[in-house]
Interface confidence: low
Amino acid sequence: IPVIEPSVPELVVKPGATVTLRCVGNGSVEWDGPPSPHWTLYSDGSSSILSTNNATFQNTGTYRCTEPGDPLGGSAAIHLYVKDPARPWNVLAQEVVVFEDQDALLPCLLTDPVLEAGVSLVRVRGRPLMRHTNYSFSPWHGFTIHRAKFIQSQDYQCSALMGGRKVMSISIRLKVQKVIPGPPALTLVPAELVRIRGEAAQIVCSASSVDVNFDVFLQHNNTKLAIPQQSDFHNNRYQKVLTLNLDQVDFQHAGNYSCVASNVQGKHSTSMFFRVVESAYLNLSSEQNLIQEVTVGEGLNLKVMVEAYPGLQGFNWTYLGPFSDHQPEPKLANATTKDTYRHTFTLSLPRLKPSEAGRYSFLARNPGGWRALTFELTLRYPPEVSVIWTFINGSGTLLCAASGYPQPNVTWLQCSGHTDRCDEAQVLQVWDDPYPEVLSQEPFHKVTVQSLLTVETLEHNQTYECRAHNSVGSGSWAFIPISAGAHTHPPDEFLFTP
């Protein structure tokens, strides 16, 4: 640890005196003290001499000697008082900035330790301190205001009693800053606005912060609007509110509105869009195709997006047929609001039955009128197949009827032996029927096709199979000729019942 000579904690001298402070350490040493005039510094290896031959009140302060090379960071200090009868205070800083709840040191150093008993801290012009100000005094350091509050941001003077009169220091401005977590919080209401020309509208931009020092403005497109600001303070936050009231909107009021607030921490902004329309509107749309195909037994959700202003006065889902007069159960209809002017309406159709194919219409009404959006729902079925033996124009013919949706295509197979289903090893011949005759093809119903296979003579130890398939599945029917006639065989696995 370095050693200071003279080896006293405090030194009291008169103005104009010569002061020599010597510091000796094991290695090189450094002096640190208040910035003041007239000091000269002389260093010689492990010692350093700080001296002045004309001490002034401004030399009052604590001088510390440190040894930079010392791993323990030891230091020694001496406090110098230059007792000037005309200058009881040496003010080291005229502005002190702290955050709320920190201790604020007002660095007015007493130049004469004898005056300590008569010191006080006042606000400028001799005003008393604010109530609840908790402070302490150190002749070496000055006055400390403990746990400073924002409201204590004032100009202070240190007062000393000299010969029965109070002598003030120059003023020290204390700035107590709020601990600001970030830019002001913002709200812009509404998030979106639509009005018919001539209607009234209101847009409210509000910002809040723990500190009053922030700015807020509302701009339309890129023009800052001159709106009177309402200020408030509640829940320990300052609030600034800008309210734009438009009695009769016109097209020039439309566009983008931005609420912008800024403070020392930065800027926040939020925007909304204001649409001005000539008249009421009601638009229905769907992201889905209006023509839907679903496999029987599966489920489907029909979704309609509604954009409307003014709001809807009524809406419902309707089944338009053709199978029955049943109507969708209300519990299966669901409405969700995306925002003020956009809504999504969903109709859930679980485990679809054949009788539920057909047209579903969503109807909605507002002052702009009625609108409807209709979905066409067709059910998909795997093919059902049947084969019969008949004579057409005197020729023996196998007649295969296949029914399903989408329209099934048909393939005939002839294979050796008697079997429920031909396998590759047994196949003797294959005939594709690219154009089977369509027997029935009504909307929302299965398509029934018919394929004819003319057979001159039925081979008795063989099987004739009609296979039909579509995108949903396949079906087949095996025809086995027997001497007593013909035996038809649907495959065991084909037990589909819709």
Epitope: Q94, P128, I151, Q154, S171
Partner: antibody, heavy 126, light 106 residues
Framework: EVQLVESGGGLVKPGGSLRLSCAAS????????MSWVRQAPGKGLEWVGR??????????DYAAPVKGRFTISRDDSKNTLYLQMNSLKTEDTAVYYC?????????????????WGQGTTVTVSS | DIQMTQSPSSLSASVGDRVTITCQAS??????LNWYQHKPGKAPKLLIY???NLETGVPSRFSGSGSGTDFTFTISSLQPEDIATYYC????????FGGGTKVEIK
């Protein structure tokens, strides 16, 4: 006699600048805290800002509407107070008064704005 | 900033009437309040300083009272030369004027 005389008012366009002066006499100007106060047409008195004496740090304070646009300075050697007004707005149109806020004369200290100039008119208009 | 709310904004009274004007501060300002008289075309005049002290040369019919947040200015017997606008002003933290009270004679 304690006296304040303002000058420098006039007509200026929005966004323009103007510098007002206030010549002081009859008291120790260097010890005084000086303020500017204005009165817009049909409105009340509004404090603009102040400058403290050099012995009290010579610091300045401003009212919110003018902060960042107006600058108060002093030349103690000329016993003169100044108000530099930049980025002027139409709402800055007013009669501007220079006034003492706190000053010493003959060993007695006076608090309150008891010395006022006659006022100088500033008109901001396009 | 400290706000000063002055009321009424205007009043009409007869010569010899007692006139009272109130001023309310948005926070405690101790007694750091002045009252001024302002006549058209003239510079304002300090009447009362530190809430209740009468400025030298001001007639004794003018008086002030109050401390903290509520202050009162009184003209005990209104005279024709008292027609003016009166302002309160705080100097506890920066300076703020009240909105003014215009006094007229009936």
């Amino acid at each position: 006699e304690v006296q304040l005389v303002e000058s420098g008012g006039g007509l200026v366009k929005p966004g323009g600048s103007l510098r007002l002066s206030c010549a002081a006499s009859g008291f120790t100007f260097s010890n005084a805290w000086m303020s500017w106060v204005r009165q817009a047409p049909g409105k009340g008195l509004e404090w603009v800002g102040r400058i403290k004496s050099k012995t009290d740090g010579g610091t300045t304070d401003y009212a919110a509407p003018v902060k960042g646009r107006f600058t108060i300075s002093r030349d103690d050697s000329k016993n003169t107070l100044y108000l530099q007004m930049n980025s002027l707005k139409t709402e800055d149109t007013a009669v501007y008064y220079c006034t003492t806020e706190y000053y010493g004369s003959g060993g007695v200290w006076y608090y309150g704005m008891d010395v006022w100039g006659q006022g100088t008119t500033v008109t901001v208009s396009s | 900033d400290i706000q000063m709310t002055q009321s009424p904004s205007s009043l009409s009274a007869s010569v010899g009437d007692r006139v009272t004007i109130t001023c309310q501060a948005s926070q405690d300002i101790s007694n750091y309040l002045n009252w001024y008289q302002h006549k058209p075309g003239k510079a304002p005049k300090l009447l009362i300083y530190d809430a209740s002290n009468l400025e030298t040369g001001v007639p004794s019919r003018f008086s002030g009272s109050g401390s903290g947040t509520d202050f009162t200015f009184t003209i005990s017997s209104l005279q024709p030369e008292d027609i003016a606008t009166y302002y309160c002003q705080q100097y506890d933290n920066l300076l703020t004027f009240g909105g003014g009270t215009k006094v007229e004679i009936k």
